[in-house]
C-alpha cells in the first residue's frame, strides 16, 4: 500500500531573467527512492538516479542546475517557462509518487514568490 505523500512548493512565481528552485519532498513512507524525474508537460528536464547521479536533458543543460538535494534550479527564466512542472518519485516497493508545481514567470520587476519551501 502506498502511504507516502509529496509536499511541493505549490504555485510559485518568479521574475523573467531570474531563477527559481523547484522542490518536492516525499514523506510518510519508508520506501527507497530509486529515481526522481523532473518533467514539464511534454518533456523531461532532469533525472536524479540513486546509483548514477544526475542527468540533465540536453535542451535544458545551459539553464538547469541539479539541486539543492533532489530539487531542481531553473535559471534565466523566460515567460515561456510558465506552466506545470512535475516531480516523479520512483520508489521501491511503493511505486510512483507524483507532485505538481505551477510556475508563473512574470514580466514585471516585482514577482510575488510563494512561501519558500523548507525540507524538514
Amino acid at each position: 500500500m502506498m502511504t507516502g505523500t509529496i509536499e511541493t512548493t505549490g504555485n510559485i512565481s518568479a521574475e523573467k531573467g531570474g531563477s527559481i528552485i523547484l522542490q518536492c519532498h516525499l514523506s510518510s513512507t519508508t520506501a527507497q527512492v530509486t529515481q526522481v524525474n523532473w518533467e514539464q508537460q511534454d518533456q523531461l528536464l532532469a533525472i536524479c538516479n540513486a546509483d548514477l547521479g544526475w542527468h540533465i536533458s540536453p535542451s535544458f543543460k545551459d539553464r538547469v542546475a541539479p539541486g539543492p538535494g533532489l530539487g531542481l534550479t531553473l535559471q534565466s527564466l523566460t515567460v515561456n517557462d510558465t506552466g506545470e512542472y512535475f516531480c516523479i518519485y520512483h520508489t521501491y516497493p511503493d511505486g510512483t509518487y507524483t507532485g505538481r508545481i505551477f510556475l508563473e514567470v512574470l514580466e514585471s520587476s516585482v514577482a510575488e514568490h510563494g512561501a519558500r519551501f523548507q525540507i524538514p
Partner: antibody, heavy 121, light 107 residues
Framework: DVQLQESGPGLVKPSQTLSLTCTVS?????????WSWIRQPPGKGLEWIGY???????NYNPSLKSRVTISVDTSKNQFSLKLSSVTAADTAVYYC??????????????WGQGTSVTVSS | DIQMTQSPSSLSASVGDRVTITCRSS??????LAWYQQKPGKSPKLLIY???SRYSGVPDRFSGSGSGTDFTFTISSLQPEDFATYYC?????????FGGGTKLEIK
C-alpha cells in the same frame, strides 16, 4: 578512443554459470561512468541485463535478477558478468557497453563488438 | 516493465528516400528515448538520445522526435550505408527496454 572487448567461453553447459569479462581501454575506471551488459538472442532484439555504477551499485533486469552478478575490477580496467543456471534460452551474443549517464542518460554510447555464447550439452 | 513497440518491423526503400520509423511505449517515458543502428554481425551504434538529440558525429540526415509514448525516427535521404536494423530504447526507468527492431532493406 574508448574501446570495450568482451571475452569468455563460447560454449557453456546447461545449469552451469556463464562468465564473461569486458576489458576497457583508452579510458580510466575512476571517472563518472557506469558499465552495462546487454544481450541479443540469435535473430532477435536487444535485452538489457544490468549495470554497475562508478560507486559499485548494481541494478539488474528483474527478469534475470536472481541469476545475475555484475562486478568490477578497477585495477585491471575490467568488469564482468556472471549468469548462473543457464539454459538454451540464454544463448545469445553478449555485449558490454559504457553509460555516460550525465550526458546521455541511460543511452549507451560505447559498445564492445559482442561475444557469442551458446548453451548446449 | 515498459514495453516498446516498433513499426514497421521491416521496410524496403531506395537510396535518396525519406524513411520514417515509429516507436510506441506502453507507458509514459517523457523524452527519454534513444535510437540505435545495428549492421549484421556488428554492435549497435547510438544515433539519437533524449528523443531528439543527435549523438556526436551522427550525420544530420538522422533525426528523432516525440514525447510521452509516441516517437518517430527519420532518415531524410537514405544513403547506401544506412541499410541496417534500427532499435529504439527507453531510458526513462530501469529496466531499460528496447523495441523489436526495424530492418531497413534495399528496394
Amino acid at each position: 578512443d574508448v574501446q570495450l572487448q568482451e571475452s569468455g567461453p563460447g560454449l557453456v553447459k546447461p545449469s552451469q554459470t556463464l562468465s564473461l569479462t569486458c576489458t576497457v581501454s583508452g579510458h580510466s575506471f575512476t571517472s563518472d561512468y557506469a558499465w552495462s551488459w546487454i544481450r541479443q538472442p540469435p535473430g532477435k532484439g536487444l535485452e538489457w541485463i544490468g549495470y554497475i555504477s562508478y560507486s559499485d551499485s548494481t541494478n539488474y533486469n528483474p527478469s534475470l535478477k536472481s541469476r545475475v552478478t555484475i562486478s568490477v575490477d578497477t585495477s585491471k580496467n575490467q568488469f564482468s558478468l556472471k549468469l548462473s543456471s543457464v539454459t538454451a534460452a540464454d544463448t545469445a551474443v553478449y555485449y558490454c557497453a559504457r553509460l555516460d549517464y550525465g550526458n546521455y542518460g541511460g543511452a549507451m554510447d560505447y559498445w564492445g563488438q559482442g561475444t557469442s555464447v551458446t548453451v548446449s550439452s | 516493465d515498459i514495453q516498446m513497440t516498433q513499426s514497421p518491423s521491416s521496410l524496403s526503400a531506395s537510396v535518396g528516400d525519406r524513411v520514417t520509423i515509429t516507436c510506441r511505449s506502453s507507458q509514459h517515458v517523457s523524452t527519454a528515448l534513444a535510437w540505435y543502428q545495428q549492421k549484421p554481425g556488428k554492435s549497435p551504434k547510438l544515433l539519437i538520445y533524449s528523443a531528439s538529440s543527435r549523438y556526436s558525429g551522427v550525420p544530420d540526415r538522422f533525426s528523432g522526435s516525440g514525447s510521452g509514448t509516441d516517437f518517430t525516427f527519420t532518415i531524410s535521404s537514405l544513403q547506401p550505408e544506412d541499410f541496417a536494423t534500427y532499435y529504439c530504447q527507453q531510458h526513462y526507468i530501469t529496466p531499460w527496454t528496447f523495441g523489436g527492431g526495424t530492418k531497413l532493406e534495399i528496394k
